[in-house]
């Protein structure tokens, strides 16, 4: 059981992917802090030459959904929906392999950006993965 809140997305950095859908936040005023963090991360990514087009096409929406997870509307308590593990692994191991290696070895990026750990996500086909967020 989670101890958080479901509230409409109020930011702009991820509005293209999230719109004004309801997102899960651990505290009522956390959205502003996360919005600032993701803007800082996007600023670093945008000015870096380490991001390929094929990676950014999927990494940006994926980071948005990770930072601002949709609320699970099938749950009776506020609960975030996970990213889909298979897509997370494709992103990390295929589409953005070079970028992930660079990011994980760069303290400046790690300070500003929480990267999803695919191993923490439920296995495909498991009941917990049934409602995962597909990019």
């Amino acid at each position: 059981e989670e101890d958080g809140f479901c509230q409409p997305y109020r930011g702009i950095a991820c509005a293209r992917f999230i719109g004004n859908r309801t997102v899960y936040m651990e505290s009522l005023h956390m959205q502003g802090e996360i919005e600032n963090q993701i803007t800082a991360a996007f600023t670093m990514i945008g000015t870096s030459s380490h991001l390929s087009d094929k990676c950014s096409q999927f990494a940006i929406p994926s980071l948005c959904h990770y930072a601002f997870p949709y609320c699970d509307e099938t749950s009776s308590v506020p609960k975030p929906r996970d990213l889909c593990r298979d897509e997370c692994e494709i992103l990390e191991n295929v589409l953005c392999q070079t970028e992930y290696i660079f990011a994980r070895s760069n303290p400046m990026i790690l300070m500003r950006l929480k990267l999803p750990n695919c191993e923490d996500l439920p296995q495909p086909e498991s009941p917990e993965a049934a409602n995962c967020i597909r990019i």
Partner: antibody, heavy 119, light 107 residues
């Protein structure tokens, strides 16, 4: 030096269209939120729309939703406001401004461009 | 939409006076409030962001504070160049809304 320069204002008939431009220089354009804010003659400030060029995300005021479209060309460091189905109440000075995040203030503003909707 | 109710709409003051302008949000906006100064025919200028942070280059006589949904802009000692219109703005929710403005005039 950070600069925002608006252009494209003028006189247009009700129901007509106009495209405003906001040319940015002196900063990493795609990393900032660009806003359009308007001010009717003798009135207060009204926020109109915003775009985050890096993710092409946009948000609008209800009063312009469906009529106005905000866009950005990162290769030209320019934001645009396409205004269709213009009404007399859209008459205002239109400013573009930037903010590093929507949760922070608009720290640089352009000089404004006047849009007059009248027959 | 979140309403930002600014008061007073105008005030007369003398150089050296302490001036206080208030903005009340119709619901919680956290600390996502900025204050701007605008002079006739000019673009607004940012004074305060995040309710109480002084923007770079703004004189220290300007300050901002928050108490719940009430936000205050204070000018500790009014200077001749401070006669202008002041606006608050919330950026917590869409649409981003401004207060109606407070015109500070010379007494």
């Amino acid at each position: 030096e950070v600069q925002l320069v608006e252009s494209g204002g003028g006189l247009v008939q009700p129901g007509g269209s106009l495209r405003l431009s906001c040319a940015a220089s002196g900063f990493t354009f795609q990393s900032y939120v660009i806003h359009w804010v308007r001010q009717a003659p003798g009135k207060g400030l009204e926020w109109v729309a915003a775009i985050y060029p890096y993710s092409s995300s946009t948000i609008y005021a209800d009063s312009v939703k469906g009529r106005f479209t905000i866009s950005a060309d990162t290769s030209k460091n320019t934001a645009y406001l396409q205004m269709n189905s213009l009404r007399a109440e859209d008459t205002a000075v239109y400013y573009c401004a930037r903010s590093w995040s929507v949760y922070l203030g608009m720290d640089y503003w352009g000089q404004g461009t006047l849009v007059t909707v009248s027959s | 939409d979140i309403q930002m109710t600014q008061s007073p709409s105008s005030l007369s003051a003398s150089v050296g006076d302490r001036v206080t302008i208030t903005c009340r949000a119709s619901q919680s906006v956290s600390s996502a409030v900025a204050w701007y100064q605008q002079k006739p025919g000019k673009a607004p200028k940012l004074l305060i962001y995040s309710a109480s942070s002084l923007y770079s280059g703004v004189p220290s006589r300007f300050s901002g504070s928050r108490s719940g949904t009430d936000f205050t802009l204070t000018i500790s000692s009014l200077q001749p160049e401070d006669f202008a219109t002041y606006y608050c703005q919330q950026s917590y929710d869409s649409p981003r809304t401004f207060g109606q403005g407070t015109k500070v005039e010379i007494k």
